[in-house]
């Protein structure tokens, strides 16, 4: 995974704006899913909180030390000025842990983006036309990824010749929206912390 060099940007911390939009968009989508899929377990009381990024990314582990070590004294030996090509941390001196945290957030977004796009392609084929993913939510994920802009291999959308299992897709949608909302809260907290520091 590459952690490239920064391009200065005089503006305020733009990723905070994107992360707030993301949290709003996923919350709205989840609300819509709860209402539309009323016969599916889609409330936070009913759902199983599972995470598709488990064992694949380490966002909580990578980002938690940022809050625990506000003065970054224990990170000074590893401090460096590499950051992202994107505008999120432009013109900031960044610790290794901070770069790792943002890189992990990017990987999370990429994984969820692939899952959501794959699911949406299936839902668009559903004769019941019951629910589709909010294009705004997909666009906001894109925007935040572009703002982070890590050099990363693009993951092709999972295409399948199989007939879509609409029943499973809707159950999975509820599980993933809940998991993604929790991750969006984490991302927003990280961005708020970085904006304040």
């Amino acid at each position: 995974r590459n952690l490239p060099v920064a391009t200065p940007d005089p503006g305020m911390f733009p990723c905070l704006h994107h992360s707030q939009n993301l949290l709003r968009a996923v919350s709205n989508m989840l609300q819509k899913a709860r209402q539309t899929l009323e016969f599916y377990p889609c409330t936070s009381e009913e759902i199983d909180h599972e995470d598709i990024t488990k064992d694949k990314t380490s966002t909580v582990e990578a980002c938690l030390p940022l809050e625990l070590t506000k003065n970054e004294s224990c990170l000074n030996s590893r401090e460096t000025s590499f950051i992202t090509n994107g505008s999120c941390l432009a013109s900031r001196k960044t610790s290794f842990m901070m770069a790792l945290c943002l890189s992990s957030i990017y990987e999370d977004l990429k994984m969820y983006q692939v899952e959501f796009k794959t699911m949406n392609a299936k839902l668009l084929m559903d004769p019941k036309r019951q629910i589709f993913l909010d294009q705004n939510m997909l666009a906001v994920i894109d925007e935040l990824m572009q703002a982070l802009n890590f050099n990363s291999e693009t993951v092709p959308q999972k295409s399948s010749l199989e007939e879509p299992d609409f029943y499973k897709t809707k159950i999975k949608l509820c599980i993933l929206l809940h998991a993604f909302r929790i991750r969006a809260v984490t991302i927003d907290r990280v961005m708020s912390y970085l904006n304040a520091s």
Epitope: E46, I47, D48, H49, E50, I52, I171, K172, I175
Partner: nanobody, 114 residues
């Protein structure tokens, strides 16, 4: 390593009943959503019933009212009670998680025929 062992299948007459059992071990946690899937001859595997860790259930339209999914989180078991069986229910039945369903058991064959 994940292990899923399905049992309880067999030959049954139309209108009859069967109870399928799934023993789950390894990294299949009791807080995962679980489901029963079936694979008809020449078709792909499809989800037919789903149960959350807290016992909330849903069913595919074609088994609603006939099949009942349940689980025992302590024993790591998932069950499928199948009533009013029809010839078109003839298939291999599997249990698995809803997410991360990478490893599959051997399944259990259910044949409904007179």
């Amino acid at each position: 390593e994940v292990q899923l062992v399905e049992s309880g299948g067999g030959l049954v007459q139309p209108g009859g009943s069967l109870r399928l059992t799934c023993a789950a071990s390894g990294s299949i946690a009791s807080n995962s959503a679980m489901g029963w899937y079936r694979q008809l001859p020449g078709k792909q595997r499809e989800l037919i019933a789903h149960i959350t860790s807290r016992g909330h259930t849903t069913y595919a339209d074609f088994v609603k009212g006939r099949f009942t999914i349940s689980r025992d989180n302590v024993k790591n078991m998932v069950y499928l009670q199948m009533n009013s069986l029809k010839p078109e229910d003839t298939a291999v039945y599997y249990c698995n998680k809803i997410l991360h369903s990478d490893y599959w058991g051997q399944g259990t064959q259910v044949t409904v025929s007179s």
